[in-house]
Each structure stands twice: as structure tokens, then as C-alpha cells.
């Protein structure tokens, strides 16, 4: 009883986990990236810096149960939503700041998943169906990456020292988590 009340958290169920991280799908209605709304970028900011360690992006966490159709994980999970922009760490006091966000005057920086953690979860199903195990991939940390304009902002460049390596032998797979689902989780996290 109570199974019908579950909302589908659209968790990505993964048959096989690759070795390298990959960027998430774009969030819809991401107002933090709307330059016009925020009045564009100032020509200079006193806190501008090229030191990688000075940059930070906000990590919003959430907690949920993994669902797959009518089945639900025995234990809940927690993971991150990497939100929007990057800026100097000293301007992002608690990782979750309110008010205006600092913008660099050079290339755009985006906060994206850095490290994923593979977790095996046990799914419990209604109607006496046997429990089944699934692997899920959860976002464990975020980092800043630079978007280059040369590739129509499609190429993400590592802001850290090590560039993202190509994903060899990885078959493309449909992503179960929709942008809408991501956005809902993001709004929930505020």
C-alpha cells in the first residue's frame, strides 16, 4: 500500500558504468544563465582571477528514493545538482548564496558534475515481485568548466588540470532524467 503515491524521480538506471564523468543535459529555464536578465557582464570585476583554486560553484544537494516504474529503492540516496554559474570562492560564502552572482568578463564558466559514484540499490516492488538490484550513478561533486565560444558553446573545457578524457567504447544511452525533472529537483533544493 502507498505505492501509487510515489512520484517517479526519473533516476538514471545504468546497465554499465563508464570510467569518466560526462556533462549533464542542460537545464530548462535556467535563469542564472540568462545574461540579459542580469544586465550583461561588467567589463571588469576586482575579484577576477585566473587561479583555478579561487573558483567555486554552488552545489545543491537533495535526497530521494530511486524509483523504476512501480518499484522503489529500499534505501534513499543523496546526490548533488550542480547549479549554473561559477565565481570566485570568496564571493560564494555558503555555496548557496542569494542575490547577484559574479560573472567573469572572459569566457563563460559552467558548474557541472565532476565526480559520479556508482551505487548498487535494491529495488522493492509491489505485488510480491522479487526485489531486484540496480546500479545507479549519483553526482558526488561539482566543478567549474570553461565553455569555449569557438564550438558554439558546445565544448566544455576542464577548469582543472586534467582534461576530460574521451569515453572509449561507451555506447550512447538514453538519459532517463529529463531536464524538467532536473529543474524540479533544483527548485526543490532552494
Amino acid at each position: 500500500q502507498g505505492w501509487q503515491a510515489f512520484k517517479n524521480d526519473a533516476t538514471e538506471i545504468i546497465p554499465e558504468l563508464g570510467e569518466y564523468p560526462e556533462p549533464p543535459p542542460e537545464l530548462e529555464n535556467n535563469k542564472t544563465m540568462n545574461r540579459a536578465e542580469n544586465g550583461g557582464r561588467p567589463p571588469h570585476h576586482p575579484f577576477e582571477t585566473k587561479d583555478v583554486s579561487e573558483y567555486s560553484c554552488r552545489e545543491l544537494h537533495f535526497t530521494r528514493y530511486v524509483t523504476d516504474g512501480p518499484c522503489r529503492s529500499a534505501k534513499p540516496v543523496t546526490e548533488l545538482v550542480c547549479s549554473g554559474q561559477c565565481g570566485p570562492a570568496r564571493l560564494l560564502p555558503n555555496a548557496i548564496g542569494r542575490g547577484k552572482w559574479w560573472r567573469p568578463s572572459g569566457p563563460d564558466f559552467r558548474c557541472i558534475p565532476d565526480r559520479y559514484r556508482a551505487q548498487r540499490v535494491q529495488l522493492l516492488c509491489p505485488g510480491g515481485e522479487a526485489p531486484r538490484a540496480r546500479k545507479v550513478r549519483l553526482v558526488a561533486s561539482c566543478k567549474c568548466k570553461r565553455l569555449t565560444r569557438f564550438h558554439n558553446q558546445s565544448e566544455l573545457k576542464d577548469f582543472g588540470t586534467e582534461a576530460a578524457r574521451p569515453q572509449k567504447g561507451r555506447k550512447p544511452r538514453p538519459r532517463a532524467r529529463s531536464a524538467k525533472a532536473n529543474q524540479a529537483e533544483l527548485e526543490n533544493a532552494y
Epitope: E59, H61, K75, V121, V139, A189
Partner: nanobody, 118 residues
Amino acid sequence: EVQLVESGGGLVQAGGSLRLSCAASGRTFSRDVMGWFRQAPGKVREVVGSITWSGGSTYYADSVKGRFTISRDNAKNTMYLQMNSLKPEDTGVYYCAVAELGSTYNDWGQGTQVTVSS
């Protein structure tokens, strides 16, 4: 392994308030998240909300947003759940649990009963 002990539950009238505590002993890491969960009679356990141990980032289920507040005191290794404007549907056993970011909640407390009468 972390040991978790909840306290502060009890019987309260609708519209009233309660404050639950969850005391943690054992290891805690900066990437840990502590969560509150509840289970009503005959229902499955559900998420109430959670808080990161380091940054103080909080997450709330829609059903409690604006009424419940999660906080923590790192010096005391304790997390709190301030519950205001309680409703009969908030009745249940409240559990706290801990997880590392990007993983499952594996360590659980024994729970504390909250009953909201109409």
C-alpha cells in the same frame, strides 16, 4: 559506522510545534549528509529533508516546505528538525540517517514517535 539517536518526539495538537534532535556519534565527514525521514502507520518511509554536514545546504520535501526547518550543530554532532504548524498527517515515526554525498543512507537511528491530534 555512525550511531544515531533521535529524541524530542511526543503528542502535540494540530497547529503546534515540536523540535526533534538527532545525536550522532562515531565518524562524520565533511561530505556527509544527514537526513530526516518519516513513516506513517501503514505507509512507506518518506523523505522529510536533509542537510549537509559542512556547508549547511538544506533540502525539504514539498509536503513540509515552509513549516519544517532542519539545522545542525557541528560542535555537538547534532541535527535538529523544527516542526511548526503541525498537521495530523505529520503523524509517524521520525528517523534520522546519514549518508556520504552520492550514496545511499546506510546508517539509521531507531526513530522517535510524533503524534499530531486534531
